[in-house]
């Protein structure tokens, strides 16, 4: 039996700059029941607070609701592990909520096969920003990527689309079914997970015009 091993803060993420969650990896438990607590202070302030909500985001996590989230403050976060033999603390993590945003994926992914006047066909991919994103006010600006592949293929083809919420993909194989996904990233922050797949079959012959 021994004191607990040092826990490690795995990551902190915010979906929208309004709330955030931090997750940690427990260290070894020293063969004894071990309690974990997350404490934090805000840069420039002396007061230390304990995690307001250990339940919402699941095991080994702390959820900060709107009430506890400030975007102009740096949080100094530590996880403490305690058992009967002693305690240990993680290295502190400095968190600026502006820089930890991982949004929900884009939505309303639509796929349309189109044809240019020269008979060249292309796939027109369109989508909308994630629901929580207030793009117009500048609170968020998102950059996007799409990826697609033939249904049977292993490797995805990725296209960066900047701030555009549409993209034309040329040179696709007729008769082939393609899977398409999109994801987004705020100016400061992390890529969202990929959206659900949408699929489209490229026609063998195509007679419609734009």
């Amino acid at each position: 039996q021994s004191p607990p091993g040092k826990p490690e803060i795995h990551k902190c993420r915010s979906p929208d700059k309004e709330t955030f969650t931090c997750w940690w990896n427990p260290g070894t438990d020293g063969g004894l029941p071990t309690n974990y607590s997350l404490t934090y202070s805000k840069e420039g302030e002396k007061t230390t607070y304990e995690c307001p909500d250990y339940k919402t985001s699941g095991p080994n996590s702390c959820f900060f609701s709107k009430q506890y989230t400030s975007i102009w403050k740096i949080y100094i976060i530590t996880v403490n592990a305690t058992n009967q033999m002693g305690s240990s603390s993680s290295d502190p993590l400095y968190v600026d909520v502006t820089y930890i945003v991982e949004p929900e994926p884009p939505r309303n992914l639509t796929l349309e096969v189109k044809q240019l006047k020269d008979k060249k066909t292309y796939l027109w991919v369109k989508w909308s920003p994630p629901t929580i994103t207030d793009v117009k006010t500048g609170w968020f600006t998102m950059e996007y990527e799409i990826r697609l592949k033939p249904e049977e293929a292993e490797e995805w083809e990725i296209h960066f689309t900047g701030h555009q919420t549409q993209f034309k993909v040329f040179d696709l194989y007729p008769g082939q079914k393609y899977l398409v996904q999109t994801r987004c990233k705020p100016d400061h922050g992390y890529w969202s997970r990929w959206s659900q797949e949408s699929s489209v079959e490229m026609p063998n012959d195509f007679t419609l015009k734009d």
């Epitope: 793009v135 117009k136 500048g138 600006t141 998102m142 950059e143 990527e145 083809e157 990725i158 296209h159 960066f160 689309t161 900047g162 701030h163 555009q164 993209f167 034309k168 100016d187």
Partner: antibody, heavy 120, light 107 residues
Framework: EVQLQQSGPELVKPGASVKISCKAS????????IHWVKQSHGKSLEWIGY????????GYNQKFKSKATLTVDNSSSTAYMEVRSLTSEDSAVYYC?????????????WGQGTSVTVSS | DIQMTQSPASLSASVGETVTITCRAS??????LAWYQQKQGKPPQLLVY???TLAEGVPSRFSGGGSGTQFSLKINSLQPEDFGSYYC?????????FGSGTKLEIK
């Protein structure tokens, strides 16, 4: 005919700021990205950043993030780049360029360039 | 950031000759490569994008090739107006970066 008309040459003092304009015509301004590119005398090209007028979204080269600010005025189809805290390293020709309407990063039409000279 | 290495730095050739300029990306950029021509005192002009697609109005003696990390620009039957500087640029994802340029001079 697509045209990008940039403002005239600037002679500015170290520490000052300069705001360069790029007036677009001949296409729907909000449908295309506007990029800004720096070319120091006799040197290669450096991408500064871009702005998408449709939603004011910007992307910057980290090197220029604290040096340049990109904005647009959609009512006049004009893009602007402000360069601040100027030093002799900022003396260069600055170009605005239109991004291809589909692929973000290739630039199909260019302004004539604005020469900025920083000197006391 | 993705580095673009262009070669040669300079090149002398005669009217009517064929020349090839190469560009190497420090990582896979698929086909996201553009080529520009620049004349003294003028802005660059787009020649090729997506590695091999000729921009509008560009003569067919220009051709682009390659994918992944290795790319080339070939100019067949050089004309007097082809002399100047050439730059490659990746347009895969931000930050977009340019090669250091190739100066093509008349022999």
């Amino acid at each position: 005919e697509v045209q990008l008309q940039q403002s005239g040459p600037e002679l500015v003092k170290p520490g000052a700021s300069v705001k360069i304009s790029c007036k677009a015509s001949g296409y729907t301004f909000t449908d295309y990205n506007i990029h800004w590119v720096k070319q120091s005398h006799g040197k290669s090209l450096e991408w500064i950043g871009y702005i998408y007028p449709n939603n004011d979204g910007t992307g910057y080269n980290q090197k220029f993030k604290s040096k340049a600010t990109l904005t647009v005025d959609n009512s006049s189809s004009t893009a602007y780049m402000e360069v601040r805290s100027l030093t002799s390293e900022d003396s260069a020709v600055y170009y605005c360029a239109r991004g291809d309407g589909n692929y973000v990063g290739d630039m199909d039409y260019w302004g004539q360039g604005t020469s900025v000279t920083v000197s006391s | 950031d993705i580095q673009m290495t262009q070669s040669p730095a300079s090149l002398s050739a005669s009217v009517g000759e064929t020349v090839t300029i190469t560009c190497r990306a420090s990582e896979n950029i698929y086909s996201y490569l553009a080529w520009y021509q620049q004349k003294q005192g003028k802005p660059p002009q787009l020649l090729v994008y997506n590695a091999k697609t000729l921009a509008e109005g560009v003569p067919s003696r220009f051709s682009g090739g390659g994918s992944g990390t290795q790319f080339s620009l070939k100019i067949n039957s050089l004309q007097p107006e082809d002399f100047g500087s050439y730059y490659c640029q990746h347009h895969y994802a931000t930050p977009f970066t340019f090669g250091s340029g190739t100066k093509l001079e008349i022999k």
